[in-house]
């Protein structure tokens, strides 16, 4: 089992849309998938959870963060729109 994040480090304009790509490899048909982030102050935050049926984000994600769980692609992409300066962090996909 493995996770691949194919989005490079990126600098984006505030107000734009950003998609962070994540694909996973497993034969399990309903994996638990997660996004976490480490902010510049080194604080660690849960961002989003999802499985085949539902997704749930941390309180700060409301309205601007969403996930695209594309089963056929084994993908769990994180979408931030519009992105803000306070979203600056290193984002990690996990399952």
């Amino acid at each position: 089992d493995k996770v691949t994040q194919s989005s490079p480090d990126q600098t984006v304009a505030s107000g734009s849309e950003v998609v962070l790509l994540c694909t996973y490899d497993t034969v399990y048909s309903n994996p638990d998938l997660f996004w976490y982030r480490i902010r510049p102050d080194y604080s660690f935050q849960f961002v989003f959870y999802g499985d085949n049926s539902r997704s749930e984000g941390a309180d700060f994600t409301q309205g601007r963060f969403s996930v695209k769980h594309i089963l056929t692609q084994k993908a769990f992409h994180l979408v931030i729109s519009p992105v803000r300066t306070e979203d600056s962090a290193t984002y990690y996909c996990a399952f």
Partner: antibody
Framework: EEKLEESGGGLVQPGGSMKLSCVAS????????MNWVRQSPEKGLEWVGQ??????????HYAESVKGRFTISRDDSKSSVYLQMNNLRAEDTGIYYC????????????WGQGTLVTVSA | DIQMIQSPASLSVSVGETVTITCRAS??????LAWYQQKQGKSPQLLVY???KLADGVPSRFSGSGSGTQYSLKINSLQSEDFGSYYC??????????FGGGTKLEIK
């Protein structure tokens, strides 16, 4: 609202070429693998091929029956996917659909309305 | 390539009856299977995905089941609007993501 619109179908002679287009709107086109599926009364639904993402180097996969004759390409800046069909045969006649599989939290499969390709002398 | 064997090819039934359509994969597809309904002159409409999950707006009389290589679509208490063609499709592993041969459901 998510929408796929195919165009470019018509009548072509055996051995001829044709290029189909599919324009997408209402979703983040660049993150989805795009597929072409065709349908004929004889064969039912037949998966034709697929193109993946820029991060996959736009990898393509084809059904054995079209390999070497059909080429799928995409232009993410135009939210468009194309099917170049060469050396067409009578058995390629059918309705060609552009489709993609969406997020499991929205809708799982999206299809265009199809465009008819007729290969006949 | 994975082959999808769908049966029966056609079925003539009355309104109110229960119908089961089956699909057998040539190898394990780990529930990566969808069922579609298609009416004459229309694009296919998704009914079920990942073998058992009902797509939005699909009536509860439809249900999908199965695992491994054996899958089925059951329609309880058939309604007149259920008549048409049904197809399974796998989406496991490297394409081609083949469809079954289809089942034509006709009114008796």
């Amino acid at each position: 609202e998510e929408k796929l619109e195919e165009s470019g179908g018509g009548l072509v002679q055996p051995g001829g070429s044709m290029k189909l287009s599919c324009v997408a709107s209402g979703f983040i086109f660049s993150i989805y693998w795009m597929n072409w599926v065709r349908q004929s009364p004889e064969k039912g639904l037949e998966w034709v091929g697929q193109i993946r993402l820029k991060s996959d180097n736009y990898a393509t996969h084809y059904a054995e029956s079209v390999k070497g004759r059909f080429t799928i390409s995409r232009d993410d800046s135009k939210s468009s996917v194309y099917l170049q069909m060469n050396n067409l045969r009578a058995e390629d006649t059918g309705i060609y659909y552009c489709m993609y599989y969406g997020s499991s939290y929205e809708r799982f499969a999206y299809w265009g309305q199809g465009t008819l390709v007729t290969v006949s002398a | 390539d994975i082959q999808m064997i769908q049966s029966p090819a056609s079925l003539s039934v009355s309104v109110g009856e229960t119908v089961t359509i089956t699909c057998r994969a040539s190898e394990n597809i780990y529930s990566n299977l969808a069922w579609y309904q298609q009416k004459q002159g229309k694009s296919p409409q998704l009914l079920v995905y990942v073998a058992t999950k009902l797509a939005d707006g699909v009536p509860s009389r439809f249900s999908g089941s199965g695992s491994g290589t054996q899958y089925s679509l059951k329609i309880n208490s058939l309604q007149s609007e259920d008549f048409g063609s049904y197809y399974c499709q796998h989406f496991w592993g490297t394409p081609p993501w083949t469809f079954g041969g289809g089942t034509k459901l006709e009114i008796k």
